[in-house]
């Protein structure tokens, strides 16, 4: 059974992940972003279901495409290099979903824009955090 300290750690990791995803969204979904129109042409796979930490496997599998889109951004728009930002997210995702169980991600039929994709995972983090508090 999860202890209060492990629950607190999970909550802090989710909050960190949430802030990272929100920060990326803020850098993209903005009228000052010269590459917004181009970025919105890229398609991302959305999870069929995302209600548990193991479903973060679906986010992990889309981190490489996410990094590629972020590489389009001007360097002044991101004070962290996309590679470092995605690396940070990857570390948190791996810790949260755990590596002991292998989960095959199921994707929805419809693809999404980068904004829809980020909003989906932001909602996921907020939802899990609310169950922990």
């Amino acid at each position: 059974a999860p202890t209060s300290s492990s629950t607190k750690k999970t909550q802090l990791q989710l909050e960190h992940l949430l802030l990272d995803l929100q920060m990326i969204l803020n850098g993209i979904n903005n009228y000052k972003n010269p590459k917004l129109t181009r970025m919105l042409t890229f398609k991302f796979y959305m999870p069929k279901k995302a209600t548990e930490l193991k479903h973060l496997q679906c986010l992990e599998e889309e981190l490489k495409p996410l990094e590629e889109v972020l590489n389009l951004a001007q360097s002044k728009n991101f004070h962290l290099r996309p590679r470092d930002l995605i690396s940070n997210i990857n570390v948190i995702v791996l810790e949260l979903k755990g590596s002991e169980t292998t989960f095959m991600c199921e994707y929805a039929d419809e693809t999404a824009t980068i904004v829809e994709f980020l909003n989906r995972w932001i909602t996921f983090c907020q939802s899990i955090i609310s169950t922990l508090t």
């Epitope: 990326i24 803020n26 917004l36 932001i122």
Partner: antibody, heavy 121, light 111 residues
Amino acid sequence: QVQLVESGGGVVQPGRSLRLSCAASGFTFSSYGMHWVRQAPGKGLEWVAVIWYDGSNKYYADSVKGRFTISRDNSKNTLYLQMNSLRAEDTAVYYCAREEWELEDYGMDVWGQGTTVTVSS
Amino acid sequence: DIVMTQTPLSSPVTLGQPASISCRSSHSLVHSDGHTYLSWLQQRPGQPPRLLLYKISNRFSGVPDRFSGSGAGTDFTLKISRVEAEDVGVYYCMQTTQFPTFGGGTKVEIK
């Protein structure tokens, strides 16, 4: 001095069109992004649209998308808002505001006095 | 869209006394460039809005130093150290981290 002066407001019937203008003076107009923001009677502020300094990018609030068009003529130092298919809920004071975000982003640092649009049958 | 929530709706203040307005965003306003694009605007009766503060706490030119801003992430505060008669009006917080949205406004009036 730095100034933005809106014009073109008036009373118009639902479904009709109107074009607002915003004349800029006292600064290098072509260096600034420009916004339209509106304020319904007795209500708060609502962002309407933005256009880049060179006109290359334009974005709209969902409430006006497909009906309003923002444009600019840098040779005339003028910003425009073409409003089609007007509705009663478009009744508001319309302000233009400037924003420079390439060097030092102060936000919307200069606002016009506003022009009133009333949509009524 | 990022939703901006201001409190209180109205703030009756005694001249010379401090006033404080809170603004909360539905989403962190920290941009990927490291800045937080949160501004405060003042609208005096019958006047257009006027920029007071930008990027949380930076006073715009000509703004008296009795106005100050603080906060981070999702929670922000505008403080007027000693309210003067000319400060009467409606104050709005505004974010331009994503597409612009405004708080509902806080009316500052003299008791």
